[in-house]
Interface confidence: low
């Protein structure tokens, strides 16, 4: 990766000695790009979703050496400047989760509750087992709500 420092130059150019000068980007207007900042440096051009910088921004100048994330293990879902991909989410069976959609290079794993488990929060890191009713069910357990049970002694319809 080729870059150079010059106190007299702030733009990519060729000076009288034929040296390449590289501007450093000190303002970033693009929104929602992850990993913009590294050791006081800004990278110039992001890697596409599903890839990462082969090495850190400080080495890279404005032409990123982008390499793929590990299929099934890592992903990046948007353009970014990071030298790391994100680790795929694990759907922890011990917490009542199972895989709904497998992780790809460009999309994180999507988890859902296992059968007979539910989660009533917007982000589910674990699912709770559905309550087993001793005296009958008013409403079945769903992925997002627990079973509603009849109380002891309540009359059935």
């Amino acid at each position: 990766r080729l870059s150079s420092k010059s106190v007299n130059a702030q733009v990519t150019d060729i000076n009288s000695k034929g040296l390449e000068l590289r501007k450093t980007v000190t303002t970033v207007e693009t929104q929602n790009l992850e990993g913009l900042h590294h050791d006081g440096q800004f990278c110039h051009k992001p890697c596409p979703p599903g890839e990462r910088k082969a090495r850190d921004c400080t080495v890279n100048g404005d032409e990123p050496d982008c390499v793929p994330c590990q299929e099934g293990k890592e992903y990046t879902d948007k353009a970014h400047f990071s030298s790391k991909c994100r680790r795929c989410r694990l759907c922890d069976e011990g917490h009542g989760l199972e895989v709904e959609i497998n992780c790809t290079r460009t999309q994180n794993t999507k988890c859902r509750c296992k059968p007979n488990f539910f989660c009533n929060s917007t982000v589910c890191e674990h699912c709770d087992p559905c309550t087993k009713c001793e005296h009958g069910i008013i409403k079945e357990c769903t992925l997002t709500s627990n079973t509603k049970c009849k109380e002891e002694g309540s009359r059935s319809n």
Epitope: L2, E20, P48, R55, D65
Partner: antibody, heavy 115, light 111 residues
Framework: EVQLVETGGGLVQPKGSLKLSCAAS????????MNWVRQAPGKGLEWVAR??????????YYAESVKDRFTISRDDSQSMLYLQMNNLKAEDTAMYYC??????WGQGTTLTVSS | DIVLTQSPASLAVSLGQRATISCRAS??????????MQWYQQKPGQPPKLLIY???NVESGVPARFSGSGSGTDFSLNIHPVEEDDIAMYFC?????????FGGGTKLEIK
């Protein structure tokens, strides 16, 4: 996995011409600057040429020793890098490596210039 | 051009000991607070293999026995403890300015 495979080396007579090729895979070729580096038998490493990406107008740079004789080019659609070498001299005899700006190297291809 | 002077030209070290190779640049290779200096290992019939980038960052898969240090114009590569597999040529390289330049190389041998 990043892969760079150089081809096209061989035996050429002085003042002859030859074109080296480098097939790239495993990374986003079209956004990367690419380089040729050579190594004469039993000698050190010498940078030869560099070509930047389309967004940098395919700007090219050459070592003084090859200027006006060698031409670096690329075909982004095929992820190929080339080095056209004209008016070859005995001192151009070397192993030629294709190198990304990220310091990934190919295995090299050998050029021998001899009568 | 930036001239890189590597020393020593050859080095014989006992197994388990420390090997230190120096690289001095004719002008600073600093780039906005980082030094664009690389170290390579090359074995016969093989292309150079990246060991260290940006002066001190160890490339993925390279043993922790290898370390790089320095800034500005003075850099060094340390190998400790030296192993049989480390017998090779070692080169420094700067990428701060075109043309990229390389040190003349250091041949590491075992005593």
């Amino acid at each position: 996995e990043v892969q760079l495979v150089e081809t096209g080396g061989g035996l050429v007579q002085p003042k002859g011409s030859l074109k080296l090729s480098c097939a790239a895979s495993g990374f986003t070729f079209n956004t990367n600057a690419m380089n040729w580096v050579r190594q004469a038998p039993g000698k050190g490493l010498e940078w030869v040429a560099r070509i930047r990406s389309k967004s940098n107008n395919y700007a090219t740079y050459y070592a003084e020793s090859v200027k006006d004789r060698f031409t670096i080019s690329r075909d982004d659609s095929q992820s190929m890098l080339y080095l056209q070498m004209n008016n070859l001299k005995a001192e151009d005899t070397a192993m030629y490596y294709c190198v990304t700006d990220g310091y990934y190297w190919g295995q090299g291809t050998t050029l021998t210039v001899s009568s | 051009d930036i001239v890189l002077t590597q020393s020593p030209a050859s080095l014989a070290v006992s197994l388990g000991q420390r090997a230190t190779i120096s690289c001095r640049a004719s002008e600073s290779v600093e780039y906005y607070g980082t030094s664009l200096m690389q170290w390579y290992q090359q074995k016969p019939g093989q292309p150079p293999k990246l060991l260290i980038y940006v002066a001190s960052n160890v490339e993925s898969g390279v043993p922790a026995r290898f370390s790089g240090s320095g800034s500005g114009t003075d850099f060094s590569l340390n190998i400790h403890p030296v192993e049989e597999d480390d017998i090779a040529m070692y080169f420094c390289q700067q990428s701060t300015k075109v043309p990229w330049t390389f040190g003349g190389g250091t041949k590491l041998e075992i005593k």
